[in-house]
């Protein structure tokens, strides 16, 4: 028989889980795991199942984004009787199985984290052989990636009536606070835009009117650090252009 179930118990167990006759399918994952960009994270996932001493072929799968339909980021398969789960897919070569699926452990290591990895992940196990059965975590584990600020773009743009404006875009998690400093400015938070839709870690600050020539510095700061970048405005007086 083929059966797909969803789990109701998703608490992180610290002990290794072993199957017993009365056990049902369940998966244990923590609600959230946090790690810094550039570092590694572990996504824990253990499971119980009703098929005592199952020794047949199995496949371990991790998806991102949503259960059942989300794209696979990792997949491995273990042959009958084998403790080795042979990796068949590892997105960008950054996902590595830590756990032993034969011991009901699908825990995954994610290397070289980026802010784009900040999403929900779902573990799944499939049995094939004498027993055909499968089970997938429904709620999954949220990977929360934190990052010190990084200024991704700083520029000076023309605006109407021969004026100029400056834009500074930074990324980070928590989203950084941006401040401009420059000639006759002091320190100014200057029209900070909220994180853009679909770009949750990006923040933009605009200086709408640059009134003086000179160096304008954007500083991005959050609890993990700060970053700054500068642009220079030199207008050719009597002409309509500017050098930046």
């Amino acid at each position: 028989f083929v059966r797909t179930k969803i789990d109701t118990t998703e608490n992180l167990l610290n002990t290794e889980v072993h199957s017993s006759p009365a056990q049902r399918w369940s998966m244990q994952v923590p609600p959230e795991v946090s790690a810094e960009a550039g570092d590694a994270a572990v996504l824990p996932c253990t499971f119980t199942h009703p098929h005592r001493h199952y020794d047949g072929p199995l496949t371990a799968i991790w998806r991102a984004g949503e259960p059942y339909a989300g794209p696979q980021v990792f997949r491995c398969a273990a042959a009958r009787g084998s403790e080795l789960c042979q990796t068949a897919l590892s997105l960008h070569g950054r996902f590595r199985l830590l756990g032993n699926p034969r011991r009901n452990d699908l825990s995954l290591r994610v290397e070289r984290l980026a802010l784009a990895d900040d999403r929900r992940y779902f573990c799944r196990v499939e049995f094939a052989g004498d027993v055909h059965d499968r089970y997938e975590s429904r709620h999954g584990v949220r990977l929360h990636v934190t990052a010190a600020p990084r200024i991704v773009n700083i520029s000076v743009l023309p605006s109407p009536a021969h004026a100029f404006r400056a834009l500074c875009t930074a990324e980070g998690e928590p989203p950084p606070a941006l401040a401009w400093s420059g000639p006759a400015l002091g320190n100014s938070l200057a029209a900070v835009r909220s994180p853009r839709e679909g770009h949750g870690h990006l923040v933009t600050a605009e200086l709408p009117a640059l009134t003086h020539d000179g160096r304008y510095t954007c500083t991005a700061a959050n609890s993990l650090g700060r970053s700054e970048a500068s642009v220079y405005l030199f207008r050719f007086h009597g002409a309509s252009g500017a050098s930046t």
């Epitope: 795991v33 570092d39 994270a41 572990v42 042979q86 070569g93 590595r96 825990s107």
Partner: antibody
Framework: EVQIVESGGGLVQPGGSLRLSCATS????????MNWVRQAPEKGLEWVAQ??????????FYAESLEGRVTISRDDSESSVYLQMSSLRAEDTAVYYC????????????WGQGTLVTVSS | DIVLTQSPALAVSLGERATISCRAS??????????IHWYQQKPGQQPRLLIY???NLASGIPARFSGSGSGTDFTLTISSLQAEDVATYFC????????TFAGGTKLEIK
């Protein structure tokens, strides 16, 4: 039975080059990462380099102290791994071990018997 | 780089418990997984994996060997020392590249 056999060690002058080879058998070579670890005489162990398998795009990693002077490579058809060393220095004198590691763990579950590299004039 | 520190030598009587410690310069544990591994090296031989990820016994290793610890402090225990356990023991971390080893602890019979 897992077997790992290194060769290619010997006496080389400072500034010289050497290519170490590691032949393996008894396991499915394609499923594993391979590494070189060295041990200077009467000293501790130092990881040198790692090469991952095809699924992991044959990615290579090196100890900073050796980067630029060593290159790790593998030949899946021959179940072999190599370490090309150049600009050798006296402090590179060591026994070089070829080791195997699982794709999920950067620990070394099988080791060869090692090959001695001596850098001296 | 993560620096691992072990005491250089230890002398224990046959049949007694031997405890070898390893300290890391920063935590090597993520989400309950500790990336510390233990090796045994006898004179003139290559190292042999004993324990992986702090507490898992490697294949073919006698049950008198065990590992424990979390964060920065780890211990390899031999419950009842045998003559064949005379060797140097190394811990290694794989929390962050480059993978590093401690200097080793030489275990002798008292």
């Amino acid at each position: 039975e897992v077997q790992i056999v290194e060769s290619g060690g010997g006496l080389v002058q400072p500034g010289g080059s050497l290519r170490l080879s590691c032949a393996t058998s008894g396991f499915n070579f394609n499923d594993y990462f391979m590494n070189w670890v060295r041990q200077a005489p009467e000293k501790g162990l130092e990881w040198v380099a790692q090469i991952r398998n095809k699924i992991y795009t044959y990615a290579t990693f090196y100890a900073e102290s050796l980067e630029g002077r060593v290159t790790i490579s593998r030949d899946d058809s021959e179940s072999s791994v190599y370490l090309q060393m150049s600009s050798l220095r006296a402090e590179d004198t060591a026994v070089y071990y070829c080791t195997r590691s699982l794709t999920g763990g950067d620990y070394f579950d099988y080791w060869g018997q090692g090959t001695l590299v001596t850098v001296s004039s | 780089d993560i620096v691992l520190t072990q005491s250089p030598a230890l002398a224990v009587s046959l049949g007694e418990r031997a405890t070898i410690s390893c300290r890391a310069s920063q935590s090597v544990t993520i989400s309950g997984y500790s990336f510390i591994h233990w090796y045994q090296q006898k004179p003139g031989q290559q190292p042999r994996l004993l324990i992986y990820r702090a507490s898992n016994l490697a294949s073919g290793i006698p049950a008198r060997f065990s590992g424990s610890g979390s964060g920065t402090d780890f211990t390899l225990t031999i419950s009842s020392l045998q003559a064949e356990d005379v060797a140097t023991y190394f811990c290694q971390q794989s929390r962050k590249s480059p993978w590093t080893f401690a200097g080793g602890t030489k275990l002798e019979i008292k």
